[in-house]
Amino acid sequence: CKAMHVAQPAVVLASSRGIASFVCEYASPGKATEVRVTVLRQADSQVTEVCAATYMMGNELTFLDDSICTGTSSGNQVNLTIQGLRAMDTGLYICKVELMYPPPYYLGIGNGTQIYVIDPEPCPDSDF
Protein backbone atom coordinates (compact mmCIF):
# COMPACT_ATOMS: atom_id res chain seq x y z
CA CYS A 1 0.00 0.00 0.00
CA LYS A 2 1.79 3.11 -1.22
CA ALA A 3 1.23 6.80 -0.58
CA MET A 4 0.48 9.37 -3.26
CA HIS A 5 0.30 13.16 -3.20
CA VAL A 6 -3.11 14.77 -3.70
CA ALA A 7 -3.52 18.53 -4.15
CA GLN A 8 -6.69 20.58 -3.74
CA PRO A 9 -7.42 24.27 -3.10
CA ALA A 10 -7.39 25.48 0.48
CA VAL A 11 -10.60 27.52 0.31
CA VAL A 12 -13.68 27.67 -1.93
CA LEU A 13 -16.77 29.81 -1.54
CA ALA A 14 -20.02 28.20 -2.62
CA SER A 15 -22.25 30.12 -4.99
CA SER A 16 -25.49 31.72 -3.86
CA ARG A 17 -27.23 28.63 -5.26
CA GLY A 18 -25.26 26.34 -2.96
CA ILE A 19 -22.87 24.99 -5.55
CA ALA A 20 -19.14 24.57 -4.92
CA SER A 21 -16.53 23.35 -7.39
CA PHE A 22 -12.89 22.49 -6.94
CA VAL A 23 -10.11 20.54 -8.64
CA CYS A 24 -8.52 17.50 -7.06
CA GLU A 25 -5.16 16.63 -8.61
CA TYR A 26 -3.13 13.53 -7.88
CA ALA A 27 0.46 12.67 -8.70
CA SER A 28 0.01 9.28 -10.31
CA PRO A 29 3.23 7.25 -10.17
CA GLY A 30 2.12 5.12 -13.11
CA LYS A 31 -0.64 4.69 -15.64
CA ALA A 32 -3.67 3.86 -13.53
CA THR A 33 -6.70 2.54 -15.40
CA GLU A 34 -9.14 2.25 -12.48
CA VAL A 35 -9.37 5.18 -10.07
CA ARG A 36 -11.66 5.72 -7.12
CA VAL A 37 -12.37 9.27 -5.96
CA THR A 38 -14.09 9.95 -2.65
CA VAL A 39 -15.11 13.26 -1.09
CA LEU A 40 -15.12 13.28 2.70
CA ARG A 41 -16.38 16.03 5.00
CA GLN A 42 -14.61 16.75 8.25
CA ALA A 43 -16.40 18.89 10.79
CA ASP A 44 -16.07 18.92 14.57
CA SER A 45 -13.50 16.10 14.30
CA GLN A 46 -16.10 13.85 12.67
CA VAL A 47 -15.53 12.48 9.18
CA THR A 48 -18.36 11.44 6.88
CA GLU A 49 -18.43 10.33 3.26
CA VAL A 50 -20.12 12.83 0.95
CA CYS A 51 -19.84 10.91 -2.31
CA ALA A 52 -17.65 8.49 -4.20
CA ALA A 53 -17.10 7.37 -7.76
CA THR A 54 -14.96 4.80 -9.51
CA TYR A 55 -13.94 5.49 -13.07
CA MET A 56 -11.94 3.78 -15.75
CA MET A 57 -9.34 6.09 -17.22
CA GLY A 58 -10.74 7.81 -20.29
CA ASN A 59 -14.34 7.27 -19.21
CA GLU A 60 -16.75 9.60 -17.45
CA LEU A 61 -16.76 9.96 -13.70
CA THR A 62 -20.01 8.37 -12.55
CA PHE A 63 -21.55 9.04 -9.15
CA LEU A 64 -24.71 7.37 -7.88
CA ASP A 65 -27.98 8.81 -9.18
CA ASP A 66 -28.88 10.35 -5.83
CA SER A 67 -25.42 11.81 -5.25
CA ILE A 68 -24.97 15.52 -4.59
CA CYS A 69 -21.67 15.34 -6.47
CA THR A 70 -20.85 15.47 -10.15
CA GLY A 71 -17.46 15.47 -11.77
CA THR A 72 -15.27 15.13 -14.80
CA SER A 73 -11.76 13.77 -15.14
CA SER A 74 -8.88 14.83 -17.32
CA GLY A 75 -5.59 13.04 -16.93
CA ASN A 76 -4.61 13.22 -13.27
CA GLN A 77 -7.17 15.92 -12.47
CA VAL A 78 -10.70 15.50 -11.25
CA ASN A 79 -13.10 18.45 -11.39
CA LEU A 80 -15.61 18.02 -8.59
CA THR A 81 -18.87 19.87 -8.07
CA ILE A 82 -21.00 19.58 -4.94
CA GLN A 83 -24.58 20.82 -5.12
CA GLY A 84 -27.36 21.56 -2.67
CA LEU A 85 -25.09 23.05 -0.03
CA ARG A 86 -26.42 25.16 2.84
CA ALA A 87 -24.70 27.17 5.54
CA MET A 88 -24.77 24.21 7.88
CA ASP A 89 -22.69 22.25 5.33
CA THR A 90 -19.72 24.58 5.75
CA GLY A 91 -16.69 22.47 6.54
CA LEU A 92 -13.49 20.85 5.33
CA TYR A 93 -14.02 18.69 2.23
CA ILE A 94 -11.25 16.18 1.69
CA CYS A 95 -10.45 14.55 -1.63
CA LYS A 96 -9.31 10.94 -1.40
CA VAL A 97 -7.90 9.19 -4.47
CA GLU A 98 -7.24 5.46 -4.77
CA LEU A 99 -5.45 3.87 -7.71
CA MET A 100 -7.11 0.48 -7.81
CA TYR A 101 -5.53 -0.96 -10.95
CA PRO A 102 -2.98 -2.02 -11.97
CA PRO A 103 -1.10 -3.04 -8.81
CA PRO A 104 0.34 -1.77 -6.61
CA TYR A 105 -2.56 -0.06 -4.85
CA TYR A 106 -1.97 3.63 -4.10
CA LEU A 107 -3.84 5.85 -1.65
CA GLY A 108 -3.69 9.62 -1.58
CA ILE A 109 -5.54 11.99 0.74
CA GLY A 110 -5.60 15.75 0.22
CA ASN A 111 -5.34 18.34 2.96
CA GLY A 112 -8.92 19.38 2.36
CA THR A 113 -10.78 22.33 0.89
CA GLN A 114 -12.61 24.57 3.33
CA ILE A 115 -15.96 25.24 1.68
CA TYR A 116 -17.88 28.21 3.00
CA VAL A 117 -21.60 28.28 2.34
CA ILE A 118 -23.70 31.36 3.01
CA ASP A 119 -27.45 30.97 2.82
CA PRO A 120 -28.95 33.70 0.63
CA GLU A 121 -30.98 36.37 2.36
CA PRO A 122 -34.70 35.94 1.72
CA CYS A 123 -36.07 38.51 -0.66
CA PRO A 124 -38.00 41.24 1.20
CA ASP A 125 -41.69 41.50 0.46
CA SER A 126 -42.35 43.97 -2.27
CA ASP A 127 -45.27 46.35 -2.56
CA PHE A 128 -44.93 46.39 -6.29
Epitope: C1, E49, M100
Partner: nanobody
Framework: EVQLVESGGGLVQPGGSLRLSCAAS????????MGWYRQAPGNQRDLVAS???????YYADSVKGRFTISRDGAKSTVILQMNSLKPEDTAVYYC?????????????WGQGTQVTVSS
Protein backbone atom coordinates in the same frame (compact mmCIF):
# COMPACT_ATOMS: atom_id res chain seq x y z
CA GLU B 1 -14.19 -6.64 13.17
CA VAL B 2 -13.10 -7.66 9.67
CA GLN B 3 -12.06 -11.24 9.09
CA LEU B 4 -10.71 -13.04 6.04
CA VAL B 5 -10.99 -16.81 6.27
CA GLU B 6 -9.24 -18.97 3.67
CA SER B 7 -9.99 -22.58 2.87
CA GLY B 8 -9.23 -25.14 0.17
CA GLY B 9 -5.51 -25.71 0.58
CA GLY B 10 -3.93 -29.12 0.70
CA LEU B 11 -1.59 -31.62 -0.95
CA VAL B 12 -1.92 -32.15 -4.68
CA GLN B 13 0.12 -33.88 -7.37
CA PRO B 14 1.84 -31.89 -10.14
CA GLY B 15 -0.68 -31.10 -12.87
CA GLY B 16 -3.55 -31.21 -10.41
CA SER B 17 -6.01 -28.52 -9.34
CA LEU B 18 -7.09 -26.77 -6.16
CA ARG B 19 -9.74 -24.19 -5.44
CA LEU B 20 -8.98 -21.68 -2.71
CA SER B 21 -11.78 -19.69 -1.15
CA CYS B 22 -11.66 -16.53 0.96
CA ALA B 23 -14.72 -15.48 2.91
CA ALA B 24 -14.77 -11.81 3.89
CA SER B 25 -16.76 -10.43 6.80
CA UNK B 26 -17.65 -6.78 7.24
CA UNK B 27 -18.26 -4.25 4.49
CA UNK B 28 -14.87 -4.52 2.83
CA UNK B 29 -15.72 -6.73 -0.09
CA UNK B 30 -17.17 -4.23 -2.56
CA UNK B 31 -14.88 -1.29 -1.79
CA UNK B 32 -11.42 -2.86 -1.70
CA UNK B 33 -8.93 -4.61 -3.91
CA MET B 34 -9.10 -8.31 -3.07
CA GLY B 35 -6.01 -10.38 -3.73
CA TRP B 36 -4.21 -13.63 -3.20
CA TYR B 37 -0.57 -13.61 -2.13
CA ARG B 38 1.77 -16.52 -1.55
CA GLN B 39 4.89 -17.02 0.53
CA ALA B 40 7.29 -19.90 0.16
CA PRO B 41 9.77 -20.65 2.96
CA GLY B 42 12.57 -18.12 2.95
CA ASN B 43 10.84 -15.93 0.37
CA GLN B 44 8.85 -12.71 0.57
CA ARG B 45 5.09 -12.57 0.21
CA ASP B 46 4.27 -12.07 -3.47
CA LEU B 47 1.06 -11.05 -5.21
CA VAL B 48 -0.42 -13.91 -7.23
CA ALA B 49 -3.70 -12.42 -8.44
CA SER B 50 -6.05 -9.57 -7.58
CA UNK B 51 -9.47 -8.27 -8.53
CA UNK B 52 -10.76 -4.72 -8.14
CA UNK B 53 -14.26 -3.39 -7.39
CA UNK B 54 -14.49 -2.47 -11.08
CA UNK B 55 -13.68 -6.01 -12.15
CA UNK B 56 -10.12 -5.47 -13.34
CA UNK B 57 -8.00 -8.57 -12.84
CA TYR B 58 -4.25 -8.93 -12.41
CA TYR B 59 -2.17 -12.13 -12.60
CA ALA B 60 1.50 -12.60 -11.86
CA ASP B 61 3.35 -13.81 -14.95
CA SER B 62 4.16 -17.13 -13.29
CA VAL B 63 0.47 -18.09 -12.98
CA LYS B 64 -1.06 -16.59 -16.14
CA GLY B 65 -3.17 -19.13 -17.99
CA ARG B 66 -3.22 -21.51 -15.03
CA PHE B 67 -4.89 -19.56 -12.20
CA THR B 68 -8.24 -17.77 -12.27
CA ILE B 69 -9.47 -15.27 -9.67
CA SER B 70 -13.15 -14.44 -9.27
CA ARG B 71 -15.48 -12.92 -6.73
CA ASP B 72 -18.95 -13.85 -5.58
CA GLY B 73 -20.58 -10.68 -4.30
CA ALA B 74 -23.59 -12.50 -2.89
CA LYS B 75 -21.36 -14.61 -0.64
CA SER B 76 -18.60 -12.03 -0.11
CA THR B 77 -16.14 -14.62 -1.31
CA VAL B 78 -13.04 -14.49 -3.49
CA ILE B 79 -12.05 -17.66 -5.31
CA LEU B 80 -8.64 -18.66 -6.68
CA GLN B 81 -8.95 -21.59 -9.06
CA MET B 82 -5.52 -23.14 -9.53
CA ASN B 83 -4.97 -25.55 -12.41
CA SER B 84 -1.90 -27.27 -13.84
CA LEU B 85 -0.15 -26.89 -10.51
CA LYS B 86 3.64 -27.12 -10.36
CA PRO B 87 5.99 -27.91 -7.47
CA GLU B 88 7.08 -24.24 -7.50
CA ASP B 89 3.52 -23.25 -6.60
CA THR B 90 4.09 -24.75 -3.15
CA ALA B 91 3.60 -22.01 -0.57
CA VAL B 92 1.28 -20.60 2.06
CA TYR B 93 -1.47 -18.67 0.26
CA TYR B 94 -2.93 -15.58 1.91
CA CYS B 95 -6.10 -13.69 1.13
CA UNK B 96 -5.75 -9.90 1.30
CA UNK B 97 -8.05 -6.90 1.22
CA UNK B 98 -6.54 -3.46 0.82
CA UNK B 99 -8.12 -0.08 0.45
CA UNK B 100 -9.40 2.56 2.81
CA UNK B 101 -12.19 3.42 5.21
CA UNK B 102 -12.76 7.15 5.50
CA UNK B 103 -9.29 8.59 6.22
CA UNK B 104 -7.70 5.30 7.25
CA UNK B 105 -5.93 2.85 5.00
CA UNK B 106 -6.79 -0.80 5.54
CA UNK B 107 -4.74 -3.87 4.77
CA UNK B 108 -6.36 -7.04 6.05
CA TRP B 109 -4.82 -10.51 5.87
CA GLY B 110 -6.21 -13.98 6.32
CA GLN B 111 -4.47 -16.62 8.39
CA GLY B 112 -3.13 -18.44 5.32
CA THR B 113 -3.70 -21.86 3.81
CA GLN B 114 -0.93 -24.28 2.87
CA VAL B 115 -0.68 -25.53 -0.70
CA THR B 116 1.79 -28.33 -1.37
CA VAL B 117 2.43 -29.63 -4.88
CA SER B 118 4.36 -32.87 -4.74
CA SER B 119 4.29 -36.36 -6.14
Amino acid sequence: EVQLVESGGGLVQPGGSLRLSCAASGNIFTRNVMGWYRQAPGNQRDLVASITPGGNIYYADSVKGRFTISRDGAKSTVILQMNSLKPEDTAVYYCNARGSILLDRVNYWGQGTQVTVSS
